[in-house]
């Protein structure tokens, strides 16, 4: 009982993970305009891993996608890598744990078979989260190093008269979408792993043992015992906090003055 | 069509308060920002400050915090500028516009004439 | 503030003739983000508001004669009417629409010879 529900939880909190996986990848936000300290301008500039969003005071919103695969910094490439491997993995691991879930009969499927498996899509997610929280991170470093450089010039001054104000971007919306996300898809992973434990059977073979009775004879012959182990007797104390980021994707498109009419 | 129509002139008296409107129509009324702008003396134009009808979200020049006061009706789909503590400085034609793309203004109203005198 | 400095106030033209008139800011225009310039051009008639003709530096609003031209990028811009008619004669208003506040030019008086 307790293998299956750390299974079932293992599968649920990966697959919440996975979701904000996919979210954060998708989000517009990975970099947002930095107001701190800067003067405030009627347009507010963001980047994704695919486009980047002007959304002026006004509301309209422009997104841009970037067409171009060349032009685009490594490190910019290197994330998207990274997340869409993370996705592709955690895809993956969902489909082979769906077989795996003890509390689904799928024909005579061995528990050797479903404890495989579990371990597979347990070692899938986690490095599925790893890829994530990876790709999150390098984006997030990418960020610092690129703020501080431009703090360090952020006037740059064009004939000491007039200034250039410097865009500065800070952490996104989808970096702690991403972290997260990630950290929860790492700790499904391991619980299907330890779930995966239980589920192995462990063939204990006893020798047969004869007992001779006065009268009759008895013969007992205790054999292979499942050993249970203790995961999961806590677990109704066990509280999941999903961070239930929701993504504000909301890109208007330029309406024509008839909008007006 | 898009209107926007201004409430008639206003004479005041210094130290009192003005209340002008700007009611739209032709278009959907909580989805552009409405843009206040003030002209003296048929001289060049100021900005006074906007707001979203849709949150109530304001911003405002500096100049005009404290004085100027905006604030909208959606059921009317009125937006409004109080003034408060008018002196003579006052005294200017006061437009209400919807913003376009750039944030530029697109549609105007006629105007309302705010003459301060004692 | 920005300050959106027009020049020459006023000017002085006749039927036909070409017009240049400048708008300069104190800070650039241009967001780095779409690479456009939040600049605006207005007309402004005696006794009438003022007319959008030109936003993001170069883009005619609908409707406006195509001899209206905005150019210029970064801090210094450039309205140029190719053919002034005499439906031209107005104040024209270049405006800042990146800072807050957002902030007008003094204005250029057209004038007919």
């Known amino acids: 009982m307790a293998v299956t529900a750390c299974q079932g939880l293992g599968f649920v909190v990966s697959l919440i993970g996975i979701a904000g996986i996919i979210a954060a990848t998708c989000m517009d936000q990975w970099s947002t305009q930095d107001l701190y300290n800067n003067p405030v301008t009627a347009v507010f500039n963001y980047q994704g891993l695919w486009r980047s969003c002007v959304r002026e005071s006004s509301g309209f919103t422009e997104c841009r996608g970037y067409f171009t695969l060349l032009g685009l910094p490594a490190m910019l490439q290197a994330v998207r890598a990274l997340m869409i491997v993370g996705i592709v993995l955690g895809a993956i691991g969902l489909l082979v744990s769906i077989f795996a879930l003890k509390c689904i009969r799928i024909g005579s499927m061995e528990d050797s078979a479903k404890a495989n498996m579990t371990l597979t899509s347990g070692i899938m997610f986690i490095v599925s989260g790893l890829c994530a929280i990876a790709g999150v991170s390098v984006f997030a470093n990418m960020l610092v190093t690129n703020f501080w450089m431009s703090t360090a010039n952020m006037y740059t001054g064009m004939g000491g008269m007039v200034q250039t104000v410097q865009t500065r971007y800070t952490f996104g919306a989808a970096l702690f979408v991403g972290w997260v996300a990630g950290g929860l898809t790492l700790i499904g992973g391991v619980m299907m792993c330890i779930a995966c434990r239980g589920l192995a059977p462990e063939e204990t073979n006893y020798k047969a043992v004869s007992y001779h009775a006065s009268g009759h004879s008895v013969a007992y012959k205790p054999g292979g015992f499942k050993a249970s182990t203790g995961f999961g007797s806590n677990t109704k104390n066990k509280k999941i906090y999903d961070g239930g980021a929701r993504t504000e994707d909301e890109v208007q498109s330029y309406p024509s003055k008839h909008d007006y009419v | 069509e898009v209107q926007l129509q201004q409430s008639g002139p206003e004479l005041e008296k210094p130290g009192a308060s003005v209340k002008i409107s700007c009611k739209a129509s032709?278009?959907?009324?909580?989805?552009?920002?409405m843009n206040w702008v003030r002209q003296r003396n048929g001289k060049s134009l100021e900005w006074i400050g906007n707001?979203?009808?849709?949150?109530?979200?304001?911003n405002y020049n500096q100049k005009f915090k404290g004085k100027a006061t905006l604030t909208v009706d959606k059921s009317s789909s009125t937006a409004y500028m109080q003034l408060k503590s008018l002196t003579s400085e006052d005294s200017a034609v006061y437009f209400c516009?919807?913003?376009?793309?750039?944030?530029?203004?697109?549609?105007w109203g006629q105007g309302t004439l705010v003459t301060v005198s004692a | 503030d920005i300050v959106m400095t027009q020049s020459p106030s006023s000017l002085t033209v006749t039927a036909g003739e070409k017009v240049t008139m400048s708008c300069k800011s104190s800070?650039?225009?241009?967001?780095?983000?779409?690479?456009?310039?939040?600049l605006t051009w207005y007309q402004q008639k005696p006794g009438q508001p003022p007319k959008l003709l030109i936003y993001?530096?170069?883009t005619r609003e609908s409707g406006v004669p195509d001899r209206f031209t905005g150019t210029g990028s970064g801090t210094d811009f450039t309205l140029t009417i190719s053919s002034v008619q005499a439906e031209d004669l107005a104040v024209y208003y270049c405006?800042?629409?990146?800072?807050?506040?957002?902030?007008f030019g003094a204005g250029t008086q057209l004038e007919l010879k």
């Open positions: 516009a919807t913003v376009y793309y750039g944030n530029s203004l697109i549609y």
């Open positions: 032709g278009y959907s009324f909580t989805a552009y920002n």
């Open positions: 707001i979203d009808p849709y949150y109530g979200g304001t």
């Open positions: 800070q650039s225009l241009l967001n780095s983000g779409n690479q456009k310039n939040y």
């Open positions: 993001w530096a170069s």
């Open positions: 405006q800042n629409n990146y800072f807050y506040p957002l902030t």
